[in-house]
């Protein structure tokens, strides 16, 4: 569906399994027509999404889409949780679906768990 509204392409209930201590880039794919919107990241705390003001972010521009990136350098155990990006566009606030980061502590995992293990064995993860 073609639209000149801003659209944020994060899948509902998407997830990423990552190791504490590694660098990680969380991408918010943004489609817009003319002026690039102002985009921010927030982290869910219950039903509230707390804006991440002091975190390193950047833009990556590609031909048909742009990416607003939240940098984790490195990933910390308390980065575990759900994140959402939001765009301000013509005085409208557009919110993405949330995406969940499952952070595994390198100290408690002698080898990197598989994607299936990350999703199905929550005792490996910080929740």
């Amino acid at each position: 569906k073609e639209s000149c509204d801003v659209q944020l392409y994060i899948k509902r209930q998407s997830e990423h399994s990552i190791l504490a201590g590694d660098p990680f880039e969380l991408e918010c794919p943004v489609k817009y027509c003319a002026n690039r919107p102002h985009v921010t990241w927030c982290k869910l705390n219950g039903t509230t999404c707390v804006k991440l003001e002091d975190r390193q972010t950047s833009w990556k521009e590609e031909k048909n889409i742009s990416f607003f990136i939240l940098h984790f350098e490195p990933v910390l155990p308390n980065d575990n949780g759900s994140y959402r990006c939001s765009a301000n566009f013509q005085s409208n606030l557009i919110e993405s679906h949330s995406t969940t980061l499952y952070v595994t502590d390198v100290k408690s995992a002698s080898e990197r768990p598989s994607k299936d293990e990350m999703a199905s064995r929550p005792w490996l993860l910080y929740r």
Epitope: Q7, K11, Q13, S14, S17, T47, E95, S98
Partner: antibody, heavy 119, light 112 residues
Framework: QVQLQESGPGLVKPSGTLSLTCAAS????????MYWVRQPPGKGLEWIGR????????RYNPSFKSRATVSADKSKNQASLKLSSLTAADTAVYYC????????????WGQGTTVTVSS | DIVMTQSPDSLAVSLGERATINCKSS???????????LNWLQQKPGQSPKRLIY???KLDSGVPDRFSGSGSGTDFTLTISSVQAEDVAVYYC?????????FGQGTKLEIK
């Protein structure tokens, strides 16, 4: 429009492994979730599991967790289901389905493939 | 697992009459975005299921407007305002919020 085509054997022996493939057209599967559902003869629908083809992350129904494996091949634009340790109770129509991961624009089911577990 | 319970199991309706199918979930179906991911499927005899309604009340493209969905919390309803012969089918509600996804047991609609 989005279409799905399942393929696989119609007859599988008990204790064997079922392998089904689901080829998608009209959509790039990396922008979707693909999932598998089965329907035993004359009964209701049972969700088996799903994959995010963009990164390979899977979720399973615990009823199938130890026996089911869902995978995806982005280059072929298809998903697959493997179900092991089959018994007669696994006789069913197996459907693959695909939905838009972002905006709920579509949810499309394949035509289904009938699988009979029998020696 | 979330239990989805439909009622009735079957119903027979005269052509042009109204049909109502209920679906109750054992927990709230609100996702983290505050929306309830409750869908209705139609399965005609010998065919694969087809989504009719998503997010409780949104009609899929091409679905006649005699179909409507409503509800909130844990109680949802599918209504066919004027049943036609081609509506003979089994109707399923299912939740797309919690893992594992779960379906109602189905409601068989017949013409009286």
């Amino acid at each position: 429009q989005v279409q799905l085509q399942e393929s696989g054997p119609g007859l599988v022996k008990p204790s064997g492994t079922l392998s089904l493939t689901c080829a998608a057209s009209g959509v790039n599967i990396k922008d979707t979730y693909m999932y598998w559902v089965r329907q035993p003869p004359g009964k209701g629908l049972e969700w088996i599991g799903r994959i995010d083809p963009a990164n390979g992350y899977t979720r399973y129904n615990p009823s199938f967790k130890s026996r089911a494996t869902v995978s995806a091949d982005k280059s072929k634009n298809q998903a697959s289901l493997k179900l092991s340790s089959l018994t007669a109770a696994d006789t069913a129509v197996y459907y693959c389905a695909v939905n838009d991961g972002y905006f709920e624009y579509f949810d499309v089911w394949g035509q289904g493939t009938t699988v009979t577990v029998s020696s | 697992d979330i239990v989805m319970t439909q009622s009735p199991d079957s119903l027979a309706v005269s052509l042009g009459e109204r049909a109502t199918i209920n679906c109750k979930s054992s927990q709230s179906l609100l996702d983290s975005d505050g929306k309830p991911y409750l869908n209705w499927l139609q399965q005609k005899p010998g065919q694969s299921p087809k989504r009719l309604i998503y997010l409780v009340s949104k009609l899929d493209s091409g679905v006649p407007d005699r179909f409507s969905g409503s509800g909130s919390g844990t109680d949802f309803t599918l209504t066919i305002s004027s049943v036609q012969a081609e509506d003979v089918a089994v109707y399923y509600c299912w939740q797309d919020t919690h893992f594992p996804r779960t379906f109602g047991q189905g409601t068989k609609l017949e013409i009286k």
